[in-house]
């Protein structure tokens, strides 16, 4: 058996998603993403499609990107149903009960499906060299896929904590999947770090009523910085501030505001920071992957930030207007998440209460493993 | 036709391990997810966790997380549950069982290993 | 987890006499996923109804079930001695799985 090239990513609707390299039927693959704390993702259009074809263009799998793969998702047609030709899923249909976005926008059928009215069938999504989505494909259910894609859904999400002075960020996702950039993070993300002098630093995400926040962080950086100033969340010097235009690209440290000059920053006057103790630049830097906006708030309640209502396990809503999906592992190429020895999930913030687990720890470091699962 | 055949009663003491086995027949058995359920006398069913013997992929019920082992066995279509650090409270019937075809109902269930620990 | 509390714990019925029982979920249970088992004492479970209302292979159409959402329930048409047994209900909407406390329909 290959090793899996686990990848997963989440998008500020509160969406994470994940893809799996594994040989396996239909139901097989449909129980794994609920024993993960998920289901059978759907891959509906928008925010949705994008974040799965990140996954799928972040890198081959087993494969080495030389044949062409078959994932299973949520899309089936049932016995009752007849093949459509002129839909756009060809009477195929979804298994969630939101009917998100337009199904017009959806991918091509690399095969027509064969006409009937009698036999379910289910459907895979081929991308081609592993990596590239070609389209929808129909497939039995019985039949060995070489992978599937899970989704999960978050009420709420914790904006990545801004490391200041930390250095050697990991994160671990409820999932058990490990990166080194994770711009949003669900409920029982733990993101470890070490300060200067080498202490190590830990910081979980929790829910509760208000939102997600990061416990045990204080103040709005991982670890301080022993000067004023920050650039994309990291500490950096007066001379480092300024982005190629001349602009002033820096946000001032806690206990500091900028100054008048608009490119300094100054002793806060009475001890009052302002956006929580970050002063405003006249400019920011653009957000990206790798470099979290700067003044974010938190924390984010999706429906409060995305003018949604509040999304739960059992919804599944999707945003389709963010241009940018965040993922995990972005910095650079996507990293092949791994899963480690030592991790456990935090009881009360997973997203369901059990989570996968490899034990033969034999093939290479990307092989999952000791996958533990934790019950709310 | 499809059978779970377990492995029989053990009497065990306080502090040891035990390990018992289910042998699937009649079907594919890397294709299948294996769950293992423990009852109580007198009480009702819980679940313990599951294993994929086609990648062994596992997933256990926090509860019983450091207390029960799964493993599985591809060349004899043999599941294995072992459980350490024994005390009365894991006086039970454990039984695996296992999907197939019934979105997700266990359809098919051993006959159950009976576990007794008596010091 | 998803707590499944199944109403009532003990219940006895006449032969011929309608029966009902309850299984309440803590949180919305997609009815793809909510089954009930039969056992019987010395038995392993049977898989008795599954996708909230679909009867297994074997089971008398005297049986059915019915809900949505966070409530679900077996009815028996017309009870029969061979009925007597525990009846436990189970969800796999969300992991871990869980069983209900089960109810025990004993003959009156």
């Known amino acids: 058996e290959h090793p899996t090239a686990d990848r997963a990513g989440c998008s500020a609707s509160g969406a994470c998603y994940s893809l799996h390299h594994a040989t396996m039927k239909r139901q097989a693959a449909e129980e794994a993403c609920i024993l993960r704390g998920g289901a059978l993702s759907t891959v509906r259009a928008g925010a949705e499609l994008r974040a799965v074809l990140a996954l799928l263009r972040a890198g081959p799998g087993p494969g080495g990107g030389s044949k062409d793969l078959l994932f299973w998702v949520a899309l089936e047609r049932r016995r009752s149903h007849c093949t459509l030709e002129n839909e756009p899923l060809r009477g195929f249909s979804w298994l969630s009960s939101d009917p998100g976005g337009l199904e017009s926008d959806t991918l091509q059928w690399v095969e027509e499906p064969q006409r009937s009215c009698t036999a379910r069938r289910c459907a895979v999504l081929q991308a081609t060299g592993g990596v590239e989505p070609a389209g929808w494909k129909e497939m039995r259910c019985h039949l060995r896929a070489n992978g599937y894609l899970c989704k999960y859904q978050f009420e709420v999400l914790c904006p990545a904590p801004r490391p200041g002075a930390a250095s050697n960020l990991s994160y671990r996702a409820p999932f058990q999947l490990h990166s080194a950039a994770l711009d949003f993070s669900p409920p029982g993300t733990e993101v470890s770090a070490l300060c200067r002098g080498q202490l190590p630093i830990s910081v979980t995400c929790i829910a509760d009523e208000i939102g997600a926040r990061w416990d045990k962080l204080s103040g709005d950086v991982l670890c301080p910085c022993p000067g004023r100033y920050l650039r994309a969340g990291k500490c950096a010097e007066l001379p480092n501030c300024l982005d190629d235009l001349g602009g002033f690209a820096c946000e001032c440290a806690t206990g500091f505001e900028l100054g008048k000059d608009g490119r300094s920053c100054v002793t806060s006057g009475e001890g009052q920071p302002t956006l929580g103790g970050t002063g405003v630049p006249t400019r920011r830097p653009p957000a990206t992957a790798t470099s979290p906006v700067p003044q974010r708030t938190w924390p984010i309640r999706v429906d409060e930030k995305l003018g949604e209502t509040p999304l739960v396990p059992e919804q599944d809503n999707s945003v389709t207007s963010i241009p940018e999906i965040p993922r995990w592992g972005s910095q650079s190429t996507m990293s092949t998440l791994q899963m480690s020895l030592q991790a456990e999930s935090k009881a009360t913030i997973t997203p369901s209460g059990s989570v996968i687990s490899k034990f033969n720890s034999t093939t290479s470091s990307a092989t999952p493993q000791a996958f533990d699962s934790s019950s709310a | 036709e499809v059978q779970l055949q377990q492995s029989g009663t053990v009497l065990a003491r306080p502090g040891a391990s035990v390990k018992m086995s289910c042998k699937a027949s009649?079907?594919?058995?890397?294709?299948?997810?294996m769950h293992w359920v423990k009852q109580r006398p007198g009480q009702g069913l819980e679940w313990i966790g599951a294993i994929y013997p086609g990648n062994s992929d596992t997933s256990y019920n926090q509860k019983f997380k450091g207390k029960a082992k799964l493993t599985a066995v591809t060349s004899t279509s043999t599941a294995y549950m072992e459980l350490s650090s024994l005390t009365n409270e894991d006086s039970a019937v454990f039984y695996c069982?296992?999907?197939?075809?019934?979105?997700?109902?266990?359809?098919?269930w051993g006959q159950g290993t009976s576990v007794t620990i008596s010091s | 987890q998803i707590v499944l509390t199944q109403s009532p714990a003990i219940m006895s019925a006449s032969l011929g006499e309608r029966v009902t029982m309850t299984c309440t979920a803590s949180?919305?249970?997609?009815?793809?996923?909510l089954h009930w088992y039969q056992q019987k004492p010395g038995s392993s479970p049977k898989l008795w109804i599954y996708?909230?209302?679909n009867l297994a292979s074997g089971v008398p159409a005297r049986f059915s079930g019915s809900g949505s959402g966070t409530s679900y329930s077996l009815t028996i048409s017309s009870m029969e001695a061979e009925d007597a047994a525990t009846y436990y209900c189970?969800?796999?909407?969300?992991?871990?799985?869980?069983f209900g406390g089960g109810t025990k329909l004993e003959i009156k």
């Open positions: 069982t296992h999907y197939y075809g019934s979105d997700y109902a266990m359809d098919y």
């Open positions: 996708s909230t209302s």
């Open positions: 009649g079907y594919t058995f890397t294709s299948y997810w």
């Open positions: 189970h969800q796999y909407h969300r992991s871990p799985r869980t």
């Open positions: 949180s919305s249970v997609s009815s793809s996923y």
